[in-house]
Amino acid sequence: GSVKVLHEPSCFSDYISTSVCQWKMDHPTNCSAELRLSYQLDFMGSENHTCVPENREDSVCVCSMPIDDAVEADVYQLDLWAGQQLLWSGSFQPSKHVKPRTPGNLTVHPNISHTWLLMWTNPYPTENHLHSELTYMVNVSNDNDPEDFKVYNVTYMGPTLRLAASTLKSGASYSARVRAWAQTYNSTWSDWSPSTTWLNYYEPWEQHLGKPIPNPLLGLDSTGLNDIFEAQKIEWHEHHHHHHHH
């Protein structure tokens, strides 16, 4: 039977080295054996390049294409082939379809004033356009209570979030993950980073009444319990309403 595309290729670029296209066939397909995605920059002298797709699911194919450091003017011509049969043809402008790289190395450290300091790395080198454009979303959730989670927007420069221990349940295990987006590029969200987990050793201050402060906050200044953390907390239902389509 003839080979047909059910859902046309949808492509995103990390705007530094890779573009990824995904599409769905009308029946289970061995993507790498049956299909090829050719791509060529619309620029004088550019060569034609071929991407061998892989299966994401039975009928879903994905192709990762190495690209040069993207610039706004770059436009690629894409052609999807099944042997000699052209299944689909289109163009793709990386600067208009950005999906940032995933933030890395998320860690949690005890900090002054009964706070936790969450830190991660910006996934872009300083010379890349996106390095200074990223804002982040941090998701903090109780490992034993699905109802207990918080979402923070980090809109300032610097991949950090200060989190008051008092906002989390004492003695509970929490996990955090972070993702990024680039507002000026109207990007989609990056994938979530791997989670990092920690135990929240915090008791309400009134329960201490002269008792020693428990580790790991041992010896930390007791002031500023209600410090708020340079980030805007968003209620989950409100966030979900605005961002579920990502």
Partner: antibody, heavy 125, light 112 residues
């Protein structure tokens, strides 16, 4: 030393054909696009054609489109220009030149950084 | 097609002085920040053309720093400081952004 040596220029009658060659040395020939530029007697420079490093992409000036064919043999480090249906206005010195690096996704541009010595094509009855 | 217009078409300069040649394109040659696809070439009498400047302002290998290119978008300038007798010839600008590649008419530089 990077060098380009053209040959094949001759006196030919209108409607006739000619094949120019350009032998390259001193650089990785297959990685670079190559260009032909011509200069009519007493006139300025006119671009004729370009071919990508692999030979997969070719471009032509409107004045020669359909009559001239650019090609290359990367095994022999040689660039060609096949000229058919020649006209008096094709009379010129033809230069080959090294153009952009095309082995990268976006070609890296260094201008026409090496030129050959030129070969004279005269079309006259 | 992108039309390249050079001014002046001829120029006479005394040794040691500075010569300036202008080149204007009918469309912007700026592809991305810092990447103007504009070159300058010199053709000395009886010789093949030789490259001087590429991407608007970058000197080709072996070109003395007396030669400098500037400009962006559609307006470009080649400056030759401390002109020498050896600089005589015809100077061409060329756009390398899109097919067909196009040259300016040429500027003939004469040394007094």
């Amino acid at each position: 030393e990077v060098q380009l040596v053209e040959s094949g220029g001759d006196l030919v009658k209108p409607g006739g054909s000619l094949r120019l060659s350009c032998v390259a040395s001193g650089f990785t020939f297959r990685d670079y696009a190559m260009t032909w530029v011509r200069q009519a007697p007493g006139k300025g420079l006119q671009w004729v054609s370009l071919i990508s490093g692999s030979g997969g992409k070719t471009y032509y000036a409107d004045a020669v489109k359909g009559r001239f064919t650019i090609s290359r043999d990367n095994a022999k480090n040689t660039l060609y220009l096949q000229m058919n249906s020649l006209r008096a206005e094709d009379t010129a010195v033809y230069y080959c030149a090294v153009d952009r690096l095309t082995k990268t996704i976006r070609p890296q541009y260094y201008g026409l950084w090496v030129w050959g010595q030129g070969t004279l094509v005269t079309v006259s009855s | 097609d992108i039309v390249m217009t050079q001014t002046p078409l001829s120029l006479s300069v005394s040794p040691g002085e500075t010569a300036s040649i202008s080149c204007r394109s009918s469309q912007s040659l700026l592809y991305s920040i810092g990447y103007n696809y504009l070159d300058w070439y010199l053709q000395k009498p009886g010789q093949s053309p030789q490259g001087l400047i590429y991407l608007g302002s970058k000197r080709m290998s072996g070109v003395p720093d007396r030669f400098s290119g500037s400009g962006s978008g559609t307006d470009f300038t080649l400056r030759i400081s401390r002109v020498e007798a050896n600089d005589t010839g015809v100077y061409y600008c060329m756009q390398g952004l899109q097919s067909p590649l196009t040259f300016g008419q040429g500027t003939k530089l004469e040394i007094k």
